[in-house]
């Protein structure tokens, strides 16, 4: 077990609407120190959403993911640790404002902290269940997240914490599906990805294809929120307190205040760097803008946090 810092590193101000469990690959609980309890759900597209642990669909989803993880472990799942080099990149993001994606270390964790791996390498994430994540959150994982038709139709009514590169640590995040790829569902701005490699576990049943390419924000997206389309508001408020505020996309109840606070733990320096992770900003229907990722490539991992700069926040008001 890893006992990381007990400081709250993910806080949720808004809960997502329902998400099909078929789209989820992992969940974890936020820390007790966060006050309001929440389940952090990770989708096939490596987006994180806050969910209310009291809701039945969340309980069912966790149970489902637990079963999947257990089945995978029974079938000889193995752990594979990957260290990722995180490079600053600029990519188009949907929205019409500059968002500074900044990683700020909040605490020192153990040697196995969250680390980025290529998003197409979902298969290579650690398998099994571990009681505690490095940051002191518990988690389990399971399946994959699918595509959606048209951007104007919306996305899940949800509070996306941020889009996180696939991560794995020996004995922490797990995924029971061989691959959880997919178009950028919600936060459509992302860095280009390196070519995927086939998951050996799929062998003959695996699919082969050329390297991934950029996804267009305007496609592949509909709605999770039972019959409603998101009504994005072009207002994003920066919260000055606490850890780095991460953008959250509320897909129906979208508006100010949908912010999640994320702290980042330094990544262990062992291993060799792999491809860059994906970073993404908020999903909005129009316009494009760059996301600037600024970080120490060797030391910081996973929790990429889109944050609007002060000017951007002003422009959006």
């Amino acid at each position: 077990q890893h006992h990381g810092v007990t400081k709250c590193n993910i806080t949720c101000s808004k809960m997502t609407s329902k998400i099909p469990v078929a789209l989820l690959i992992h969940y974890q609980q936020n820390q007790a120190s966060c006050g309001k309890r929440a389940i952090i759900l990770e989708t096939r597209q490596h987006r994180l959403f806050c969910a209310d642990p009291k809701e039945q669909w969340v309980k069912d989803a966790m149970q489902h993911l637990d079963r999947q993880a257990a089945a995978l472990t029974r079938n000889g799942g193995t752990f594979e640790k990957q260290i990722g080099e995180v490079k600053p990149r600029t990519t188009p993001a949907a929205g019409g404002m500059d968002e500074s994606v900044v990683l700020e270390p909040e605490a020192t964790g153990e040697s196995s902290s969250l680390e980025p791996t290529p998003s197409s390498q979902e298969a290579q994430r650690a398998l099994g269940t571990s009681p505690e994540l490095p940051t002191g959150v518990t988690g389990s994982s399971g399946t994959r997240l699918p595509p959606t038709p048209k951007a104007q139709d919306g996305g899940p009514v949800g509070t996306e914490l941020f889009r996180v590169p696939p991560v794995s640590t020996a004995a922490t995040w797990q995924s029971s599906a061989p691959h959880q790829p997919g178009p950028s569902l919600w936060a459509e701005a992302k860095t280009s990805e390196a070519p995927s490699t086939q998951d050996p576990s799929t062998q003959a049943s695996t699919a082969s294809s050329p390297a991934p390419e950029e996804n267009a924000p305007s496609e592949g997206q509909r709605v999770w929120g039972q019959g409603q389309s998101p009504r994005p508001e072009n207002s994003l408020e920066r919260e000055e307190m606490g850890p780095v505020p991460a953008h959250t996309d509320a897909f129906q109840d979208w508006g100010p205040g949908s912010m999640a606070h994320v702290s980042v733990v330094p990544v262990s320096s062992e291993g060799t760097p792999s491809r860059e992770p994906v970073a993404s900003g908020s999903w909005t229907p129009k316009a494009e803008e760059p996301i600037h990722a600024t970080m120490d490539p060797q030391r910081l991992g996973v929790l990429i946090t889109p944050v609007p700069d002060a000017q951007a926040a002003t422009r959006r008001q």
Epitope: P20, G182, T206, S208, S209, Q221, Q226
Partner: antibody, heavy 119, light 107 residues
Framework: QVQLVQSGAEVKKPGASVKVSCKAS????????IHWVRQAPGQGLEWIGW????????KFNERFKGRTTLTADKSTSTAYMELSSLRSEDTAVYFC????????????WGQGTTVTVSS | DIQMTQSPSSLSASVGDRVTITCRAS??????LAWYQQKPGKAPKFLVY???TLADGVPSRFSGSGSGTQYTLTISSLQPEDFATYFC?????????FGGGTKVEIK
């Protein structure tokens, strides 16, 4: 407009393999999943699996794992489903269908490919 | 796996009738249900997703409702072109499963 055009009917012997193609047009191929669904004569629909053309990763219905291969060629916007070790009960119409990223429902379908397995 | 049971398996109705088709899931699918219409020799056509949201171009006489394990597709006033077989599909969890179909025939 969005179109999925499948290859023509096939007649195969038991134990053989069949490869069905599905050419997509009218949208960005790499932004959606391609699902494969089959329908035996007079029967209901059965989901086989999906492939995400963006990176070629697949997911299968356990019933089809091991003898199904799903591939996608981004250069031609074509997805393929290969089913091996055919048996008579594989006789069916095989459909490809487009799936969005927010849920695996199928908003556009190919016209279907009839595969007959007979000795 | 979640089993989807449709009822009735067939029904006879006249133009203008109100028709209701039911789909029952073996577990809670949390409204992640789609409906399709299929005519003989054709591919299914997407009608409804997320239990009640109509797909583009689907006439408003079609409506979906339900929650938990029970869902219905209603055609408020049956039109000649609506005579077909209707399938439900759950997309809450894999493997995605379909109902056995309901054939709507002309009385």
């Amino acid at each position: 407009q969005v179109q999925l055009v499948q290859s023509g009917a096939e007649v195969k012997k038991p134990g053989a393999s069949v490869k069905v193609s599905c050419k997509a047009s009218g949208y960005t191929f790499t932004n959606y999943y391609i699902h494969w669904v089959r329908q035996a004569p007079g029967q209901g629909l059965e989901w086989i699996g999906w492939i995400y053309p963006g990176d070629g990763s697949p997911k299968f219905n356990e019933r089809f794992k091991g003898r199904t291969t799903l591939t996608a060629d981004k250069s031609t916007s074509t997805a393929y489903m290969e089913l091996s070790s055919l048996r008579s009960e594989d006789t069916a119409v095989y459909f490809c269908a487009r799936g969005p990223t927010d849920g695996d429902y199928f908003d556009y379908w190919g016209q279907g490919t009839t595969v007959t397995v007979s000795s | 796996d979640i089993q989807m049971t449709q009822s009735p398996s067939s029904l006879s109705a006249s133009v203008g009738d109100r028709v209701t088709i039911t789909c029952r899931a073996s577990g809670n699918i949390h409204n992640f249900l789609a409906w399709y219409q299929q005519k003989p020799g054709k591919a299914p056509k997407f009608l409804v997703y997320n239990e009640k949201t109509l797909a583009d171009g689907v006439p408003s006489r079609f409506s979906g409702s339900g929650s938990g394990t029970q869902y219905t597709l209603t055609i408020s006033s049956l039109q000649p072109e609506d005579f077909a077989t209707y399938f439900c599909q759950q997309f809450w969890s894999t493997p995605y499963t379909f109902g056995g179909g309901t054939k709507v025939e002309i009385k």
